[in-house]
């Protein structure tokens, strides 16, 4: 029986050009975490395997850093990074748990300020 629950950072926002840490935490179970996948919609970002370490998807290698812990750091954010992110925990013996995070990437306050007071 699956008794665990995934706690996530929920809905978060960050500035364009900045970075953000995506974090999930599995609680209320003694199941062993064997692998955590990080996905954006249907696109794989990274995998952390207990035995093999981290696999970062080649197309994200420049912008994704492993950790802290089982989390994932997204760098050089763009507005296209806005959307849903999923942490998928493979555990033994429970099976799979999934958590969801919604990230909104905002135009930076400096950019907004510059746009507001632009001289024609």
């Amino acid at each position: 029986m699956m008794t665990g629950t995934i706690e996530t950072t929920g809905n978060i926002s960050a500035e364009k050009g900045g970075s953000i840490i995506l974090q999930c935490h599995l609680s209320s179970t003694t199941a062993q975490v064997t692998q955590v996948n990080w996905e954006q919609q249907d696109q794989l970002l990274a995998i952390c395997n207990a035995d093999l370490g981290w696999h970062i998807s080649p197309s994200f290698k420049d912008r994704v850093a492993p950790g802290p812990g089982l989390g994932l750091t997204l760098q050089s954010l763009t507005v296209n990074d806005t959307g849903e992110y999923f942490c998928i925990y493979h555990t033994y013996p429970d099976g799979t748990y999934t958590g969801r995070i919604f990230l909104e990437v905002l135009e930076s306050s400096v950019a907004e300020h510059g746009a507001r007071f632009q001289i024609p």
Epitope: T34, L44, I47, L52, H55, I56, K61, H90, Y92, T96
Partner: antibody, heavy 119, light 107 residues
Framework: QVQLVQSGAEVKKPGASVKVSCKAS????????MYWVRQAPGQGLEWIAF????????TYNQRFRGKATLTVDTSISTAYMELSRLRSDDTAVYYC????????????WGQGTLVTVSS | DIQMTQSPSSLSASVGDRVTITCRAS??????LSWYQQKPGKAPKLLIY???SLPSGVPSRFSGSGSGTDFTLTISSLQPEDFATYYC?????????FGQGTKVEIK
């Protein structure tokens, strides 16, 4: 197109070392891990280790710790595997292979390098 | 270690036949399984990854299925160039291990 070209066949004496090279072209070398697999004559495939050229980190099959050492030279897009303390049962074809986009599988393979250990 | 067991170890088939090869893992590997084809004197070639995904350039007559511990590679209509040895491999833990291979021969 993606290509991995390995160094030529080697004949070594027991106790010696050998260094096999794997030159990559047609893709961004640092974005993909490089794997090494061996195949003894008439036998199946055995994974040795892989290295991530992006940070130089290696992960080994415990069986090959102390036997194989992986390195890369990103400036020339080349991966290396050095095998030490060679024995006759190390005689095999050694393959390099580029890792996959979505995990720890082997997407593109080199042509193989035959290492023969004989006194 | 996760053991991978293929069956059969060899089979004889004719051009046009539907061929099925199975691979069993000693523990749950979800869908972290790949299949390779190897011809004599040549390097292996990736056919399937993540149990059912085909890399670009692999003919659609090849398909993969399964999850957990039981997996299948199917060749829907065997072609002359398909006579080879096929290996499965899990990519879920250290060490990565391969099945012992299935040799597909001409009947």
């Amino acid at each position: 197109q993606v290509q991995l070209v390995q160094s030529g066949a080697e004949v070594k004496k027991p106790g010696a070392s050998v260094k096999v090279s794997c030159k990559a072209s047609g893709y961004a070398f640092s974005r993909y891990s490089m794997y090494w697999v061996r195949q003894a004559p008439g036998q199946g495939l055995e994974w040795i280790a892989f290295i991530d050229p992006y940070n130089g980190g290696s992960t080994y099959n415990q069986r090959f710790r102390g036997k194989a050492t992986l390195t890369v030279d990103t400036s020339i897009s080349t991966a290396y595997m050095e095998l030490s303390r060679l024995r006759s049962d190390d005689t095999a074809v050694y393959y390099c292979a580029r890792g996959g986009d979505y995990g720890w599988y082997l997407g593109v393979w080199g042509q193989g390098t035959l290492v023969t250990v004989s006194s | 270690d996760i053991q991978m067991t293929q069956s059969p170890s060899s089979l004889s088939a004719s051009v046009g036949d539907r061929v099925t090869i199975t691979c069993r893992a000693s523990q749950n590997i979800y869908t972290y399984l790949s299949w390779y084809q190897q011809k004599p004197g040549k390097a292996p070639k990736l056919l399937i990854y993540n149990a059912k995904s085909l890399p670009s350039g692999v003919p659609s007559r090849f398909s993969g299925s399964g999850s957990g511990t039981d997996f299948t590679l199917t060749i829907s209509s065997l072609q002359p160039e398909d006579f080879a040895t096929y290996y499965c491999q899990h990519h879920y833990g250290n060490p990565l291990t391969f099945g012992q291979g299935t040799k597909v021969e001409i009947k």
